[in-house]
Interface confidence: low
């Protein structure tokens, strides 16, 4: 800190006074000095440190007509709203020639009613859920004792006897108000009143009850809602997208969700008009007269696949002796899911039909029993997804193989020795 020298008489003719008051007080500190020649700039120190951003003004009045005559300089430091950080020792400092001069100190102190550093805040809490409220106050004068009040009723017999900075509330079943009183030698200060709104608990166990290609039925268990009955629950569904990063704690979906309201009870809702074989994320919140619960985490769900909407295309069935070669192409109609394979049914005029699961191949060779004398053999093919069969093709009669026709080589699938189905199948 700068040090004044006493080699010459101090120029200060006035030093800062003392200010003691309550928070928020406005006050002014002044220094006055008389110097010969050009007046210097006055700096303010607090506890020995220069205040760079002090709210100060300086006035200079010459005592004579000559520039070299004496000047009276007054510097004023304004403290606009007294805070604890303003307290300390204040001095003025000037540089004159090669010397530094410091005024005598003044003191700024704080004393009065307690001051709240932290007050209870309005908040929402889930019913029957523990939470904490904070309150912090200081003097001077110390000590400061706190008294908590719930709905204007003290929670302790006397200040300082109950919880102090933190009040633990084990849970509420109705919306309540909390405040805090701070007591010191100068008196009592009351904090703001915080309203703690009791909302329903987050629903639990959001789960699928049933799935269909274009609808999902979901159910959940409602949380407690205190004395306030639930009025409705809101379900949101959003199309999942690998790149969208829905996380358990993410507050908002990345796109506009599909929102549905369910009157309660029952705590169940059927979501319709969905896409088949499509991943969604869903969440639910329930509302009482006090407001909505928090959302559940996003639950990934998926509509099941639908069946293909059309039969396989371009089916051809060719016979060559005791073998029949059948091939086809994927349906042009939407598959509504992942194609898992094809089923083929064939039947002769006087023989039971046979149903085969071909897998994903698009051709099959049937090894016919006997000498190939089965007459009027017809073949039907259907594509299937996880949801089941699509429509079967119209029966395709076997054509006799003509020389020159290509016939790919592939695995033979033999007909069971005892055919086993009623025709038509489905």
């Amino acid at each position: 800190a700068p040090r004044g020298t006493q080699a010459e008489e101090s120029p200060f003719v006035g030093n800062p006074g003392n200010i003691t008051g309550a928070r928020g007080l406005t006050g002014t500190l002044r220094c006055q000095l008389q110097v010969q020649g050009e007046p210097p700039e006055v700096h303010w120190l607090r506890d020995g440190q220069i205040l760079e951003l002090a709210d100060s003004t300086q006035t200079q009045v010459p005592l004579g007509e000559d520039e070299q005559d004496d000047w009276i300089v007054v510097s004023q430091l304004r403290i606009t709203s007294l805070q604890l950080s303003d307290t300390g020792q204040y001095q003025c400092l000037v540089f004159l020639g090669h010397q530094t001069f410091v005024s005598q100190p003044g003191y700024v102190g704080l004393e009065g009613l307690p001051y709240f550093l932290e007050e209870p805040e309005d908040r929402t809490v889930a019913a029957n859920t523990p939470f904490n409220l904070s309150c912090q106050a200081q003097g001077p004068p110390e000590p400061v004792d706190l008294l908590w009040l719930q709905d204007a009723v003290p929670l302790a017999t006397a200040p300082g006897h109950g919880p102090q900075r933190s009040l633990h509330v084990p849970g509420l079943n109705k919306t309540s108000s909390f405040s805090c009183e701070a007591h010191n030698a100068k008196g009592v200060t009351t904090s703001r009143t915080a309203t703690i709104t009791v909302l329903p608990q987050q629903p639990r166990n959001l789960h699928l009850v049933s799935r269909q290609p274009t609808e999902l039925e979901v159910a959940w268990t409602p949380g407690l809602s205190g004395i306030y009955p639930l009025t409705h629950c809101t379900l949101q569904a959003v199309l999942s997208d690998d790149g969208m990063g829905i996380q358990a704690g993410e507050p908002d979906p990345p796109e506009e969700p599909l929102t549905s309201q369910a009157s309660v009870p029952p705590h169940q809702l059927r979501l319709g008009s969905l896409h088949p074989h499509t991943p969604y994320h869903i969440r639910v919140a329930c509302t009482s007269s006090q407001g909505p619960s928090s959302w559940t985490h996003w639950l990934p769900v998926e509509t099941p696949e639908g069946v293909p909407l059309g039969p396989p295309e371009n089916i051809s069935a060719t016979r060559n002796g005791s073998q029949a070669f059948v091939h086809w192409q994927e349906p042009r109609a939407p598959l509504q899911g992942t194609l898992l394979g094809y089923r083929l049914a064939y039947q002769g005029q006087d023989t039971p039909e046979v149903l085969m699961d071909i897998g994903l191949r698009q051709e099959v060779t049937l090894e016919l029993q006997g000498d190939g004398s089965v007459s009027n053999l017809t073949v039907c093919v259907a594509a299937y997804t996880a949801a089941g069969d699509g429509p079967w093709s119209l029966p395709v009669p076997l054509e006799a193989w003509r020389p020159g026709q290509a016939q790919p080589v592939h695995q033979l699938v033999k007909e069971p020795s005892t055919p086993a189905f009623s025709w038509p199948w489905w």
Partner: antibody, heavy 120, light 107 residues
Framework: EVQLVQSGAEVKKPGATVKISCKVS????????MNWIRQPPGKGLEWIGL????????SYNQKFKGRVTISADKSISTAYLQWSSLKASDTAMYYC?????????????WGQGTLVTVSS | DIQMTQSPSSLSASVGDRVTITCKAS??????VAWYQQKPGQAPRLLIY???TRHTGVPSRFSGSGSGTEFTLTISSLQPDDFATYYC?????????FGQGTKVEIK
């Protein structure tokens, strides 16, 4: 949770008819097939037939055709197996089983079984 | 009909043993074979389908292999809960047929 709940045990005289039921829950009844399988006491499994509840299409094991009728009631998600002209050799545990979505013919969920006893 | 022949019809083994059950189809069934486990008084439970695909919730000690006409179910380390009867079944075409079963007993 997928559940298949079958009707209770039956005792029948030879020549009689029995009808047993299989009520399903936990999945879309009409989107899958229901198989029926039987197992005589101390013996292996024997496939009887299946139904696609969405349209009532059926397939039967030729061995039992004519004596067996498989049906379904979509409105109550229930499949039925009716067996006529019962013989003592038809004494068995009868199971319904849900066809796996990747192959109708592999059975992923089974009922608890219905014991049918044929005795004079 | 396709016949499915299982072997052995029964076997005795100890906890921790590696157990192999085979199943032969009378004709090529591609890879359309399922394996089931059945305990006394209970319905069968699907273990494997399409020869080697484990059904949901089936422990990894169960594995299946094979194609064409020869198929195998392997239990890599037999557990007390695994003593049961095992059936193979072709799921290629109807009528569906099962093997006669393999009973795995405690040695």
């Amino acid at each position: 949770e997928v559940q298949l709940v079958q009707s209770g045990a039956e005792v029948k005289k030879p020549g009689a008819t029995v009808k047993i039921s299989c009520k399903v829950s936990g999945y879309s009844f009409t989107g899958h097939t229901m198989n029926w399988i039987r197992q005589p006491p101390g013996k292996g499994l024997e496939w009887i037939g299946l139904i696609k509840p969405s349209n009532g299409g059926t397939s039967y094991n030729q061995k039992f055709k004519g004596r067996v009728t498989i049906s379904a009631d979509k409105s109550i998600s229930t499949a039925y197996l009716q067996w006529s002209s019962l013989k003592a050799s038809d004494t068995a545990m009868y199971y319904c089983a849900h066809g796996h979505y990747e192959s109708y013919f592999a059975m992923d969920y089974w009922g608890q079984g219905t014991l049918v006893t044929v005795s004079s | 009909d396709i016949q499915m022949t299982q072997s052995p019809s029964s076997l005795s083994a100890s906890v921790g043993d590696r157990v192999t059950i085979t199943c032969k189809a009378s004709q090529d069934v591609s890879s359309a074979v399922a394996w089931y486990q059945q305990k006394p008084g209970q319905a069968p439970r699907l273990l494997i389908y399409w020869a080697s695909t484990r059904h949901t919730g089936v422990p990894s000690r169960f594995s299946g292999s094979g194609s064409g006409t020869e198929f195998t179910l392997t239990i890599s380390s037999l557990q007390p809960d695994d003593f049961a009867t095992y059936y193979c079944q072709e799921h290629n075409s109807t009528p569906l047929t099962f093997g006669q079963g393999t009973k795995v007993e405690i040695k």
